[in-house]
Interface confidence: medium
C-alpha cells in the first residue's frame, strides 16, 4: 500500500458524518520525525477546505487548539449538504520559497436523519407474481441510508428484503420475492420500511392488507376474435384469463377513433359476443381482468388485437350527375359521374360498378361495369333516357341509384334568378340563388356544378358537384376550391323531366393580374378599328376577370388616355372602337380587372387610322 | 474479479497533451475515491489526482494542479486524466488505482508508460 498521508492524520470529531447546521472539529497531527527539518517549532499546520475541487476557504483563524509544530485542530461551522473536502498542509515558515506540502485530508458529511417513509403500496402481478412494495422516502437525505420491507401475516410468515439510496441510486421500491396465493384471500398482511443512516432511523406506519388488495391479475393473452358466417358486424371475441378472474372489461374501437366502446362482462370464461362492430373496419381490441367483483385492482390493458372486420354489401345511394354533349343533328355523347361512396356504405373494396342507361319507350339498354367513377356513351338525341348505377364488392351490389337524363339547361322558365358567388374564404365559395320565376313544373332538387375556368378543363377533368333540396337556396362548395382560380359555378334546377341552368363565374381568393391582354391585330373596317387580342394565360390571371380595358392616346401627347370597357366574355377576342382620328399615330394597349383590381398594361400597338374622320 | 485498467499513454513532445483512461470493473465503485499515481525510473511512486467516485470532488498534487485534469464517466465505469502542457519531469508509469478513504488504496492497475520527450 502506498500512504498518501506519511506524515501524518487528519481526524474528525464527533464523526465524519454530522447533521445540517452542526459544527466539527477538525484534528491534524504529524507523524513523529516528520515536519520541518532540524525546527519543529517552525512546523505550522493549515486546514484548506474543498468544494468540488475550488480552494473556497483556508482555515486558519478557526484553530481552536495548538500544540505547536505537532498537531492543530479547527472548529468548521455552516457546512453544506453533501461532501466537503478539507486538506491539512504543512508550512515551514522558515522556508517562504517552499510550498506547503499535503499531510493528509479527509471529507465531512452533511445530511439529515431519514423521514419516515409513507404512502407503502404493495402489488403482487398475477396469481404466480411476487410482492414488491414501493414507499415516498420523504427529503433528500444527502448520506447513504438503508430501507428495510418487512412483511408479516399468518402461521408466522416473515420476510424482510433490504436496498440503499445515495447520491446516484434512490431506494423507494423493493421485491420481496414471495408470492401470496389465492388460498390466503381473507388473511390479512403487515408490511412497514424502516429506513435508517448514520444520523438516525425511522419507520414507517404499518401497512395492512389482503390478498385481493394487492394481486393485480396479469393482462389477458392470446386475444383472438371469431366472425359468425363472415359477418362483418357480429364477432365472438376469445382470450386466455388467470383461473381465478371473475369480472372483463372489453373496450373496442376503429383505428382512427378517438373514444373507445366499453363492455363490462360477469364470468365470461374468456368468451364475449359483440354485435355491433362496422364491416370491413379495422378495430383494435383490449381487455382488462379482475378477481373480485367488488374489491381488487383491475389488470392492465391486454395487448391489442388489431383486425380488420369482413365485408358486407354495399348499402346507400351513390350520387350521380352527368353531362350532355350534342355530337350532330341525330347523336349526343353522355357522360356519367359518380362520388365513391363512404367506408360505412361501401362496406368493402369496391370491385367495379354496374352502369346501365336505358332508352324508356324503346326498350334500348345499354350496359357496362367499370372501375372508374366515370363512364360515357355516344346514344341517339331521340328518345327519354334513364341512368342507373350501382357499386358492388366481394359481397354483392347496392341498390341501383336512377337518374333522368334530360336537357339540363333546356328549359328557360327553369332557371334559377339572381345567382350569386361570394368568396368566404380561402377554400371555399358561397353560391345564393333565387327559384325560378314560372316553373311549369315542380323543382324536384338544385345541382350546384362547378370547374375550374382553365384550358380543356372540361375534357381533362370531370365536374364537382351537390345536390341542394329544393327548400334550400344556397351552398357553400369547397371540394376543390383553391384561391386564385376562376371557377365557372351553373345552378341547375330539375324537375322530372325537365331542367334550366344559370350560370356565374367566382372565386375564393383574388389578386389583380400579372399581366394584361395581348393586342395581336389591329384592323380596319367601315370606318371602324377591330383590335383582337389573346387572353391573359390563366394562371396569371389570380380570379375571374370582371372586364377588358381597351386604352388609346394620340402618340407623344402627355393627355390622359381615352378607354373603354368590355364586360369580359371568355368567348370574345376582339372589340370595335370607333372615335379615332383618321391619319393620327394612336398608340393602344390593354388591360384586365378582377375584383381585387387591375393588371399593369400588355404590349402597346401603334396605329394609323385611313378612313374617313367619324 | 475487480479489475483496474490504464491506457492512453505513449510518447509526446514537450508542451503537447495526453489523456489517460482507467477502465473499472468487477464491483459497485460508488463509495470509493479513485486515483493517479505515477513512479518514474528510481523514485518512489508519487501521488497525482484523486476523484471521489461519488461526489466528483477532486484533488491534485500541486506539481500537476491547473495542467492536469482528473473526471469519471459513471455509466463507462471510467477515470480519466487529462495532461496538458506536459513536461520531460513528468516521464513516468502511471497508475490508477481505488480506495475507500482519502490514504488508503486497495486496488491497483499494471500501469501505462508516458514518456515526454523532443
Known amino acids: 500500500n502506498i500512504d498518501v498521508c506519511k506524515l501524518g492524520t487528519v481526524t474528525v470529531q464527533p464523526a465524519p458524518v454530522i447533521p445540517l447546521g452542526s459544527a466539527a472539529n477538525i484534528s491534524c497531527s504529524l507523524n513523529p520525525k516528520q515536519g520541518c527539518s532540524h525546527y519543529p517549532s517552525s512546523n505550522e499546520l493549515i486546514l484548506l477546505k474543498f468544494v468540488n475541487d475550488v480552494l473556497v476557504e483556508n482555515l486558519h483563524g478557526k484553530k481552536v487548539h495548538d500544540h505547536t509544530g505537532h498537531s492543530s485542530t479547527f472548529q468548521v461551522t455552516n457546512l453544506s449538504l453533501g461532501m466537503t473536502l478539507f486538506v491539512c498542509k504543512l508550512n515551514c515558515s522558515n522556508s517562504q520559497k517552499k510550498p506547503p506540502v499535503p499531510v493528509c485530508g479527509v471529507e465531512i458529511s452533511v445530511g439529515v436523519a431519514p423521514e419516515p417513509p409513507q404512502n407503502i403500496s404493495c402489488v403482487q402481478e398475477g396469481e404466480n407474481g411476487t410482492v414488491a412494495c414501493s414507499w415516498n422516502s420523504g427529503k433528500v437525505t444527502y448520506l447513504k441510508t438503508n430501507y428495510t420491507l418487512q412483511l408479516s401475516g399468518p402461521n408466522n410468515l416473515t420476510c424482510q428484503k433490504q436496498c440503499f439510496s445515495d447520491n446516484r441510486q434512490n431506494c423507494n421500491r423493493l421485491d420481496l420475492g414471495i408470492n401470496l396465493s389465492p388460498d390466503l384471500a381473507e388473511s390479512r398482511f403487515i408490511v412497514r420500511v424502516t429506513a435508517i443512516n448514520d444520523l438516525g432511523n425511522s419507520s414507517s406506519l404499518p401497512h395492512t392488507f389482503t390478498f385481493l388488495d394487492i394481486v393485480i391479475p396479469l393482462p389477458p393473452w392470446d386475444i383472438r376474435i371469431n366472425f359468425l358466417n363472415a359477418s362483418g358486424s357480429r364477432g365472438t371475441l376469445q382470450w386466455e384469463d388467470e383461473g381465478q378472474v371473475v369480472l372483463n372489461q372489453l373496450r373496442y374501437q376503429p383505428l382512427n377513433s378517438t373514444s373507445w366502446n366499453m363492455v363490462n362482462a360477469t364470468n365470461a370464461k374468456g368468451k364475449y359476443d359483440l354485435r355491433d362492430l362496422r364491416p370491413f373496419t379495422e378495430y383494435e381490441f383490449q381487455i382488462s381482468s379482475k378477481l373480485h367483483l367488488s374489491g381488487g385492482s383491475w389488470s392492465n390493458w391486454s395487448e391489442s388485437l388489431r383486425t380488420r372486420t369482413p365485408e358486407e354489401e354495399p348499402v346507400g345511394i351513390l350520387d350521380i350527375w352527368y353531362m350532355k354533349q350534342d355530337i350532330d343533328y341525330d347523336r349526343q355523347q353522355i357522360s356519367l359521374f359518380w362520388k365513391s361512396l363512404n367506408p360505412s356504405e361501401a362496406r368493402g373494396k369496391i370491385l367495379h360498378y354496374q352502369v346501365t342507361l336505358q332508352e324508356v319507350t324503346k326498350k334500348t339498354t345499354l350496359q357496362n361495369t367499370t372501375r372508374h367513377t366515370s363512364w360515357t356513351r355516344v346514344i341517339p338525341r331521340t328518345g327519354a333516357w334513364t341512368a342507373s348505377v350501382s357499386a358492388a364488392n366481394s359481397k354483392g351490389a347496392s341498390a341501383p341509384t336512377h337518374i333522368n337524363i334530360v336537357d339540363l339547361c333546356g328549359t328557360g322558365l327553369l332557371a334559377p334568378h339572381q345567382v350569386s358567388a361570394k368568396s368566404e374564404n380561402m377554400d371555399n365559395i358561397l353560391v345564393t340563388w333565387q327559384p325560378p320565376k314560372k316553373a311549369d313544373s315542380a323543382v324536384r332538387e338544385y345541382i350546384v356544378e362547378w370547374r375550374a375556368l382553365q384550358p380543356g378543363s372540361i375534357t381533362k377533368f370531370p365536374p364537382h358537384w351537390l345536390r341542394i333540396p329544393p327548400d334550400n337556396m344556397s351552398a357553400l362548395i369547397s371540394e376543390n376550391i383553391k384561391p386564385y382560380i376562376c371557377y365557372e359555378i351553373r345552378v341547375h334546377a330539375l324537375s322530372e323531366s325537365q331542367g334550366g341552368c344559370s350560370s356565374i363565374r367566382g372565386d375564393s381568393k383574388h389578386k389583380a393580374p400579372v399581366s394584361g391582354p395581348h393586342i395581336t391585330a389591329i384592323t380596319e373596317k367601315k370606318e371602324r378599328l377591330f383590335i383582337s387580342w389573346t387572353h391573359i394565360p390563366f394562371p396569371e390571371q389570380r380570379g375571374c376577370i370582371l372586364h377588358y380595358r381597351i386604352y388609346w392616346k394620340e402618340r407623344d401627347s402627355t393627355a390622359q388616355p381615352e378607354l373603354c370597357e368590355i364586360q369580359y366574355r371568355r368567348s370574345q377576342n376582339s372589340h370595335p372602337i370607333s372615335s379615332l382620328q383618321p391619319r393620327v399615330t394612336y398608340v393602344l394597349w390593354m388591360t384586365a380587372v378582377t375584383a381585387a383590381g387591375e393588371s399593369p398594361q400588355g404590349n402597346e400597338r401603334e396605329f394609323c387610322p385611313q378612313g374617313k374622320a367619324n | 474479479q475487480v479489475q483496474l485498467q490504464e491506457s492512453g499513454g505513449g510518447l509526446v513532445q514537450p508542451g503537447g497533451s495526453l489523456r489517460l483512461s482507467c477502465a473499472a470493473s468487477?464491483?459497485?465503485?460508488?463509495?470509493?475515491?479513485m486515483g493517479w499515481f505515477r513512479q518514474a525510473p528510481g523514485k518512489e511512486r508519487e501521488f497525482v489526482a484523486l476523484?471521489?467516485?461519488?461526489?466528483?470532488?477532486?484533488y491534485y498534487a500541486d506539481s500537476v494542479k491547473g495542467r492536469f485534469t482528473i473526471s469519471r464517466d459513471k455509466v463507462k465505469n471510467t477515470v480519466y486524466l487529462q495532461m496538458n502542457s506536459l513536461k520531460p519531469e513528468d516521464t513516468a508509469v502511471y497508475y490508477c488505482?481505488?480506495?475507500?478513504?482519502?490514504?488508503?488504496?486497495?486496488?491497483w492497475g499494471q500501469g501505462t508508460q508516458v514518456t515526454v520527450s523532443s
Open positions: 488505482a481505488a480506495g475507500p478513504t482519502f490514504n488508503k488504496y486497495e486496488y
Open positions: 468487477g464491483r459497485a465503485w460508488n463509495e470509493y475515491n
Open positions: 476523484i471521489w467516485w461519488s461526489s466528483g470532488n477532486t
